[in-house]
Each structure stands twice: as C-alpha cells, then as structure tokens.
Amino acid sequence: ITQQDLAPQQRAAPQQKRSSPSEGLCPPGHHISEDGRDCISCKYGQDYSTHWNDLLFCLRCTRCDSGEVELSPCTTTRNTVCQCEEGTFREEDSPEMCRKCRTGCPRGMVKVGDCTPWSDIECVHKESGTKHSGEAPAVEETVTSSPGTPAS
C-alpha cells in the first residue's frame, strides 16, 4: 500500500459543499477552512476524513500497489481497502509489501492453516503440535501438499 499522505486542499471548488463547524469541528468527509469558519467536503476518490476534525486538509486516498486487489474504493469518509492477491500475504511487522506464501511445510511438520491475505500457511510439529515460525525452509526440506490434503 502506498503510504497514506496528507493532501493540502486547494481553494474550494464551486462543487465542494460548505457547512459550518460544530463545536469547532467538521464532520467525517470534510475538513475545516483556513479561516476556521467553514467545513469543506473532501474530494471523492481523492481524499477523505474518517472522524470529526479541525484538519485543514483531508487525508489522501491510498492507491493499491501492484500485487494487491482493491476490496473497496476510497470514499470521502473511508480510505481505500487493499488486500494481497491470492497466494500472497501481508505481515503485521512488514505491512508495506505482500509476500509469497510458502508452498508447504518443513519435514516433520504438518499444515494446519492455509495461506490467507493476512497470514502465511501455518505449520505445526507432527508430534508436539508446536507452531513453526521462521523463514521458509530450503526446497529439498519442503513437503508440499495440495489444498485440503494433510502433508505426510
């Protein structure tokens, strides 16, 4: 996902709706004007705001990277939702890119969880049932399995 940036608003175009701030704040989908007296709507598909705010600009919409699919578009009140393509996942500790899921588990381990857009396949030791974490094993150590078939 392209890092969310903040878009300075240009002078409000005629089509941008204006209303007055309430308790000094503007509603989701708006930002406050430079004199603090008006609320100016965000531009659909370009920027957004999710909460009541007194920001002088709306947040710039995220653009999904190649390798991602757009689950829902950016609206004036919600950012774009992007998801990794099938066969890839995004880890919490490295959210900037989608990584390829492993094709199978190391020898002596069995797959208990499938590849999802937010997690790699999950492997556990056959005997102890403890999870395996770490890098994908070397190819010769890998036992591949087709979906739904336990690795032997």
Partner: antibody, heavy 117, light 110 residues
Framework: EVQLVETGGGLIQPGGSLRLSCAAS????????MIWVRQAPGKGLEYIGF???????YYADSAKGRFTISRDNSKNTLYLQMNSLRAEDTAVYYC???????????WGRGTLVTVSS | DIQMTQSPSSLSASVGDRVTITCRAS??????LSWYQQKPGQPPKRLIY???TLASGVPSRFSGSGSGTDFTLTISSLQPEDFATYYC????????????FGGGTKVEIK
C-alpha cells in the same frame, strides 16, 4: 492598537486556585480561536488549550481536569481558571490569538504564576 | 497527538553565518507549520507561517521550507539581533491533535 494583556498571576500555595485574565483590544476575541501557552523557567513553550470562535474548548492532556478556558464577550476578555495548582505549574502564562492556517499571530506579554509554599 | 522534534537543541554561530534549524512532525501536516522567535523576557514572535510565508515585518534573511513531516528554518546571514530561541508549531488539527511546540533551538554567539 491590537494587543493582549494578561493579568492575575502571582504567588500561590500548592493546591490553590487562580484565574488568569487576558484582555484584548483592537479586535474581537469571539471572532477568533484563542489559545493559552505556558513556559516554565528556562524551559520551552507548552500548549495548554484553546477556545474556538463558537466557544468550544480543547485541552492538552496535561491540562485536562484542572484547567478551564472561558471567555466573556462583553468584556472582550479570555480566562484561564487553574485549580489544584502544583509546583510544576510555575511558569509564565501567555494568551495568544490563533488563526488556523496562519498560526499564533498575536501574543500577550505573559503573566508569571509561582506555585510555592 | 502530533509530536514535533526540533534539532539541534542549541547551536553556536557567528554573525554572518548561515543557520539551519529543522523540525520533524510525527505525522504529515502538509504545509501548516509556523516558526517563532523568542528572546529572553519576551513573548514569542511569529516569523513564518504555512511553512514558507514570511510574517509581516520579518526580515527577508529568514526563510522556511518543507512539507509533510520535514521542515526547515534558515537564517541566510545571522545578525546580532537573531540570537534567540526558535520554536516550530503545527497549525492543522489543533483540536484533533493538539498544538505541541517543538522543543526549541537556542542560537548562541560563538
């Protein structure tokens, strides 16, 4: 002349209360957002809170619960009510005019508050 | 809340030197940043707003630049009256995020 003048500072015992005033001249306080900022001796500027033109108030976390900002439009004056004062509240207190995009464009000269027994 | 990190916290320079002070915001604030100068016993004075717009009456040797999270105040040729402490402050979302000042940069005579 456009100016802000703070009054009400002085020596106060820990646990006491104090109300600072900020009298504006040359402009109407109710047409602007106004902020309070303080500066402990030898330290940097610390934002306390602000009041919007429609009278809504917002505070820094350090000021929530003990400090209250208000305004009297008929007197063109801003106030800072400070309760349960502590030694670490000793500072020069400034009121200032805040213009959203243009920052804090007009400052008072400040009033010194000393909290000590 | 937005945190503002200023560097350096102090510097020594001579008259005529070019001085650069930086301010980093913990999140993007577009170009909505102001710089202030404060001399001992005086209130702060606004120098620059909207990152690069010079306030009325401020000498042209002062300039500001930057957008997003990284900002710079430059004094092109330091004058005796410029020895002071300088602060940055974000100007967007004061109710949403607060308006914490940077920690300050004290410019001293070398």
């Amino acid at each position: 002349e456009v100016q802000l003048v703070e009054t009400g500072g002085g020596l106060i015992q820990p646990g006491g209360s104090l109300r600072l005033s900020c009298a504006a001249s040359g402009f109407t306080v109710s047409r602007y957002a106004m902020i309070w900022v303080r500066q402990a001796p030898g330290k940097g500027l610390e934002y306390i809170g602000f009041i919007t033109s429609d009278g809504s108030t917002y505070y820094a976390d350090s000021a929530k619960g003990r400090f209250t900002i208000s305004r009297d439009n008929s007197k063109n004056t801003l106030y800072l009510q400070m309760n349960s004062l502590r030694a670490e509240d000793t500072a020069v207190y400034y009121c200032a005019r805040y213009t959203y995009s243009d920052g804090t464009d007009l400052w008072g000269r400040g009033t010194l508050v000393t909290v000590s027994s | 809340d937005i945190q503002m990190t200023q560097s350096p916290s102090s510097l020594s320079a001579s008259v005529g030197d070019r001085v650069t002070i930086t301010c980093r915001a913990s999140q993007s604030i577009s170009t909505y940043l102001s710089w202030y100068q404060q001399k001992p016993g005086q209130p702060p004075k606004r120098l620059i707003y909207k990152a690069s717009t010079l306030a009325s009456g401020v000498p042209s040797r002062f300039s500001g630049s930057g957008s997003g999270t990284d900002f710079t105040l430059t004094i092109s040729s330091l004058q005796p009256e410029d020895f002071a402490t300088y602060y940055c402050q974000p100007n967007s979302g004061i109710a949403t995020y607060g308006a914490a000042f940077g920690g300050g940069t004290k410019v001293e005579i070398k």
